[in-house]
């Protein structure tokens, strides 16, 4: 039975040209996390494999940095980065848990700076 829950940063906003940390946390389960995938729509951004570490997709290598922890840092944000991001936790024996984050990249300084995981 899947007892775990995923907490995410929820809906966040950031300024164009800036950086943001996407963060998820899996709790309430003793399942072993074998891999975490970060995806945007159907595009794989990066994976963090429990045994082999991080792998960043080549097309995002210049703008994506691993961490902190199992999170992902997006840099040099553009308006095109606006959209849904998913953290997919592959666990054993529970199976797959998915969290959703919506990022809005704003043109001007109207982006909120209060988001807990945002980089100033």
């Amino acid at each position: 039975m899947m007892t775990g829950t995923i907490e995410t940063t929820g809906n966040i906003s950031a300024e164009k040209g800036g950086s943001i940390i996407l963060q998820c946390h899996l709790s309430s389960t003793t399942a072993q996390v074998t891999q975490v995938n970060w995806e945007q729509q159907d595009q794989l951004l990066a994976i963090c494999n429990a045994d082999l570490g991080w792998h960043i997709s080549p097309s995002f290598k210049d703008r994506v940095a691993p961490g902190p922890g199992l999170g992902l840092t997006l840099q040099s944000l553009t308006v095109n980065d606006t959209g849904e991001y998913f953290c997919i936790y592959h666990t054993y024996p529970d199976g797959t848990y998915t969290g959703r984050i919506f990022l809005e990249v704003l043109e001007s300084s109207v982006a909120e700076h209060g988001a807990r995981f945002q980089i100033p």
């Epitope: 072993q32 995938n37 082999l52 054993y92």
Partner: antibody
Amino acid sequence: QVQLVQSGAEVKKPGASVKVSCKASGYTFTEYYMHWVRQAPGQGLEWMGIISPSAGSTKYAQKFQGRVTMTRDTSTSTVYMELSSLRSEDTAVYYCARDHDIRLAGRLADYWGQGTLVTVSS
Amino acid sequence: DIQMTQSPSSVSASVGDRVTITCRASQGISSWLAWYQQKPGKAPKLLISAASSLQSGVPSRFSGSGSGTDFTLTISSLQPEDFATYYCQQAVILPITFGGGTKVEIK
């Protein structure tokens, strides 16, 4: 098309080391992990370990820990498996095999090399 | 480590026969099971992933089923090119482990 071409057969003495190479082509080398699997004569398949060609990180089966080293050369799209302190029980065909999908890394192998026979005999 | 047990270890069958091979995992692996076919002197070939998903180019006479701990590979009508050894493999967690193999021989 995807191809994994392994080095030729080797005959080694007990206590020696062997290094088997596996040259990959037909896909982006750093986008897929690589497994090593061996098969003793008339026996089943035995997983030895896996390497990430992009990072060079490895995970070895406990049985081979301390005796096996997996490395890669991204400039030639080649992975290597070195096994040391050889004994007669290490006589086997050694296969490199490409991981099926980075989204589920390390789960299964879809393309295999032709195999390299390593014979350990005094 | 997860142990994989295959049965039978060998089976004699004729062309046109239905052949069933079973694989049992020592603990639940959901649907994370693969089947490989290996012919003498050749490398294994991936037939089925995710317990029942046929790989591209694999004939439809091959089918896989099961989840949890018990899995089955079925060849609905055995063809001459199907005489080989078949291995199951758990694909849920490292280290990868294989079943001992089932040799399908000509009766």
